[in-house]
Amino acid sequence: SQVSQNCHNGSYEISVLMMGNSAFAEPLKNLEDAVNEGLEIVRGRLQNAGLNVTVNATFMYSDGLIHNSGDCRSSTCEGLDLLRKISNAQRMGCVLIGPSCTYSTFQMYLDTELSYPMISAGSFGLSCDYKETLTRLMSPARKLMYFLVNFWKTNDLPFKTYSWSTSYVYKNGTETEDCFWYLNALEASVSYFSHELGFKVVLRQDKEFQDILMDHNRKSNVIIMCGGPEFLYKLKGDRAVAEDIVIILVDLFNDQYFEDNVTAPDYMKNVLVLTLSPGNSLLNSSFSRNLSPTKRDFALAYLNGILLFGHMLKIFLENGENITTPKFAHAFRNLTFEGYDGPVTLDDWGDVDSTMVLLYTSVDTKKYKVLLTYDTHVNKTYPVDMSPTFTWKNSKLPNDITGRGPQ
């Protein structure tokens, strides 16, 4: 139902959902700090622009007794309960920041008349694609899927001369929220990835994965998984791996590969790591000082959500336009705004764009090296290392099917 918004007469409120079930197990205090830091920046930007207005955030906490699992998979109703709470208190702001769980975002979008913008740090799943008033500030599954299809089809690079059309996907159900939805998108039979591949099988057991590594009858040489190097080691250990196996490790929110003193362990030599180009370390920020890389991105998305609202508020106020209109609700897309540590580009559907980086382990230096980059905004791959020092034969990625010649 319609809720009156605290969003006029020079006073603009942001409703921040502080949910027990969250995409990442982040203390809510850290998210509050990120939001408050964002508010300070927004106030400064508006003041600099000569806009004498008040911007505040209201933190809406859910009932910890009912929703206390902390797990996104039980989050479906939590968002709706919070919206009811907001509705009853007549405390809706100009914009809603949160939720981060795909289930709760999808349900909230479905069950409410959204005449206000919704900004999410998460909501990675395909079910949250193409939502007219939803903006997502962490790379959603659709972006990953488009990279993979693009890379699979590529056959004109010195280090990749075969198109691929097959893959195994390892998905055991214990993944983090981002990985869960990334792999879910690859698994879905109706997804773009599945549509473009001729063969795809999901491996759900550790043993299935381990057996494939040396199985002469395997149907694909390529295995996609999601997590960090430690996760891979737990699964693979020091087992022998057939020489034409390629493991694609999706680890988007992890900057550790770019650190100067990092050496790639031996078990990473058959692995290509897909990550985001490194961000600023944000070490000077109160909210990020003790955070792991992934949690830093999560907190940063909350902060950038505040900055995005400030950006749009500034534009609308400067143009003398009303904030409580469908035009405002639909405006949070197809733009670049000044984020906390650099510009942030949103695509036509309000999803954040990024520069993805595919890394390999150099057999010479045992360092992670950039093989190529991929711009999600233009769906284009840019080769970087034209003569990589791969573990694979002839320093080329193998065919995805053993024994099949050039196509």
């Epitope: 900057d255 985001l276 490194p278 510009p343 950039v370 999600t376 840019y382």
Partner: antibody
């Protein structure tokens, strides 16, 4: 704290080339654009070109196209600017500068400002 | 190429007074404009980016405003350390070319 440290002053003859280095320390190097900006004595700032190390390719201002080469060596976190066919009007202080990063924006076309600068390298071209 | 024109070329101001510097672009650069301060013998220092956002560690007396083609840098109360040359820079079209304005020298009256 990220710092850019440039190589020392150079004196060159007209027609020769100069190569100035810019070493980054204290932070990730790969995904930031490193630009080169020059300033002739008593004059303003002039952008020459830039490179994003993880992309590998450089972009140049039209004025310097064909005469300047910008490269980056990720293994040493160092960017280089080589200017050839030097003439007396190339006498200037050459600065390297790093932008604010591009984790969440569209690749090479990311609009950005320079938040960290090197100390400058004086290049004198004289016969 | 986008041309940035700064005015005035020189601004004489007394300490404690307000200084207003202008930068005009030959075509719209949206909010992709930065301001830098440069003192003799030093590298430029980023003051403002995104037309109005203060860079880390920059005092609140510096503020930027404007978008499109008209931009202003305001120093609300000049301190002795603020006497320097100020440059605007557009970064709307990287690639192919970033451009700087000709600079405004703020000197003691």
């Amino acid at each position: 704290e990220v710092q850019l440290v440039q190589s020392g002053a150079e004196v060159k003859k007209p027609g020769s080339s100069v190569k100035v280095s810019c070493k980054a320390s204290g932070g990730t190097f790969s995904s930031y654009a490193i630009s080169w900006v020059r300033q002739a004595p008593g004059q303003g700032l002039e952008w020459m070109g830039g490179i994003i190390p993880i992309f590998g390719t450089a972009n140049y201002a039209q004025k310097f196209q064909g005469r300047v080469t910008i490269t980056a060596d990720e293994s040493t976190s160092t960017a280089y600017m080589e200017l050839s066919s030097l003439r007396s009007e190339d006498t200037a202080v050459y600065y390297c500068a790093r932008d604010r990063g591009r984790r969440y924006c569209s690749g090479g076309s990311c609009p950005n400002a320079f938040d960290i600068w090197g100390q400058g390298t004086m290049v004198t071209v004289s016969s | 190429e986008i041309v940035l024109t700064q005015s005035p070329a020189t601004l004489s101001v007394s300490p404690g007074e307000r200084a207003t510097l202008s930068c005009r672009a030959s075509q719209s650069v949206s909010s992709n404009l930065a301001w830098y301060q440069q003192k003799p013998g030093q590298a430029p220092r980023l003051l403002i980016y995104g037309a109005s956002t203060r860079a880390t560690g920059i005092p609140a007396r510096f503020s930027g405003s404007g978008s499109g083609t008209e931009f202003t840098l305001t120093i609300s109360s000049l301190q002795s350390e603020d006497f320097a040359v100020y440059y605007c820079q557009q970064y709307n079209n990287w690639p192919p070319a970033l451009t700087f304005g000709g600079g405004t020298k703020v000197e003691i009256k």
